[in-house]
């Protein structure tokens, strides 16, 4: 039975040219996290394997930095980076948990963080 929940940074906004940290946290389960995949719609951004380390997709290697922790840092943001991002937690024995973050990249300097929310 999957008892865990994923807490994410929720809906966030950031300035064009700036950077943002995408962060998820898995709680309420003793399952072992074996891997976290970071994906944007149909694209793979990065993989963090608990044992083997990080894989960064070459399409994003100049703009994505691993961490902090299991999170992902997006740099040199463009308006095209606006959209949904998913953290996919592969765990044993529970299986897969998915968290969603919506990022809006703004032209203006008015960029405020949204509230945190949970996805069961």
């Amino acid at each position: 039975m999957m008892t865990g929940t994923i807490e994410t940074t929720g809906n966030i906004s950031a300035e064009k040219g700036g950077s943002i940290i995408l962060q998820c946290h898995l709680s309420s389960t003793t399952a072992q996290v074996t891997q976290v995949n970071w994906e944007q719609q149909d694209q793979l951004l990065a993989i963090c394997n608990a044992d083997l380390g990080w894989h960064i997709s070459p399409s994003f290697k100049d703009r994505v930095a691993p961490g902090p922790g299991l999170g992902l840092t997006l740099q040199s943001l463009t308006v095209n980076d606006t959209g949904e991002y998913f953290c996919i937690y592969h765990t044993y024995p529970d299986g897969t948990y998915t968290g969603r973050i919506f990022l809006e990249v703004l032209e203006s300097s008015v960029a405020e963080h949204g509230a945190r929310f949970q996805i069961p």
């Epitope: 793979l44 044992d51 960064i56």
Partner: antibody
Framework: QVQLVQSGAEVKKPGASVKVSCKAS????????MHWVRQAPGQGLEWIGG????????SYNQKFKGRATLTVDKSISTAYMELSRLRSDDTAVYYC????????????WGQGTTVTVSS | DIQMTQSPSSLSASVGDRVTITCKAS??????VAWYQQKPGKAPKLLIY???FRYTGVPSRFSGSGSGADFTLTISSLQPEDFATYYC?????????FGQGTKVEIK
């Protein structure tokens, strides 16, 4: 230049163990994950597992968990793969390979070590 | 485990031919696929990584495409040194798995 040089061919009896070594040179050993892949005669490639010398973490194909042990000696930039309780179907060429920095493909391979299990 | 199924398992072609090898994953693996070339008695060599990126020193006649579950390796004009066996590999999830191989033979 990057080189992965493996130990020589081995002939073992069923039930025995074998330890294959892979000496790395031409790159910073601790910054790359070392993997082991085997190929039975006339067959395809099978991933055994990988060892990250930086973190000390290792990931195994469940098929080999409990029989395969991956280790490294950082002082001599050498990776090892030990396979115990050998069976005849473990007869194969065993390759070490390096995964690229921040990539999970295998960009450099050793020359292979033939392990023959026969009574 | 994720299964990688290559087709065809073997093919005969002539120098100068355009050759296409396909690889189908049993589930979505995004672009986490590499292609290798192996010649008899030798270790595999990396050709393509992350589905479509040509590895350093690999001739431009080799190209990779696809995402999700369907991937293709194309050799635009087969050369004598290209007769070999080709493998796809997924690294989306451990255990990493390979296709069964496609042997490209001289017609």
């Amino acid at each position: 230049q990057v080189q992965l040089v493996q130990s020589g061919a081995e002939v073992k009896k069923p039930g025995a163990s074998v330890k294959v070594s892979c000496k790395a040179s031409g790159f910073t050993f601790t910054e790359y994950t070392m993997h082991w892949v085997r190929q039975a005669p006339g067959q395809g490639l099978e991933w055994i597992g990988g060892f990250n010398p930086n973190s000390g973490g290792s990931s195994y194909n469940q098929k080999f968990k409990g029989r395969a042990t991956l280790t490294v000696d950082k002082s001599i930039s050498t990776a090892y793969m030990e396979l115990s309780r050998l069976r005849s179907d473990d007869t194969a060429v065993y390759y070490c390979a390096r995964s690229s920095y921040y990539r999970f493909d295998l960009d450099y391979w050793g020359q292979g070590t033939t392990v023959t299990v026969s009574s | 485990d994720i299964q990688m199924t290559q087709s065809p398992s073997s093919l005969s072609a002539s120098v100068g031919d355009r050759v296409t090898i396909t690889c189908k994953a049993s589930q979505d693996v995004k672009t986490a696929v590499a292609w290798y070339q192996q010649k008899p008695g030798k270790a595999p060599k990396l050709l393509i990584y992350s589905a479509s990126f040509r590895y350093t020193g690999v001739p431009s006649r080799f190209s990779g495409s696809g995402s999700g579950a369907d991937f293709t390796l194309t050799i635009s004009s087969l050369q004598p040194e290209d007769f070999a066996t080709y493998y796809c590999q997924q690294h989306y999830l451990t255990p990493w798995t390979f296709g069964q191989g496609t042997k490209v033979e001289i017609k």
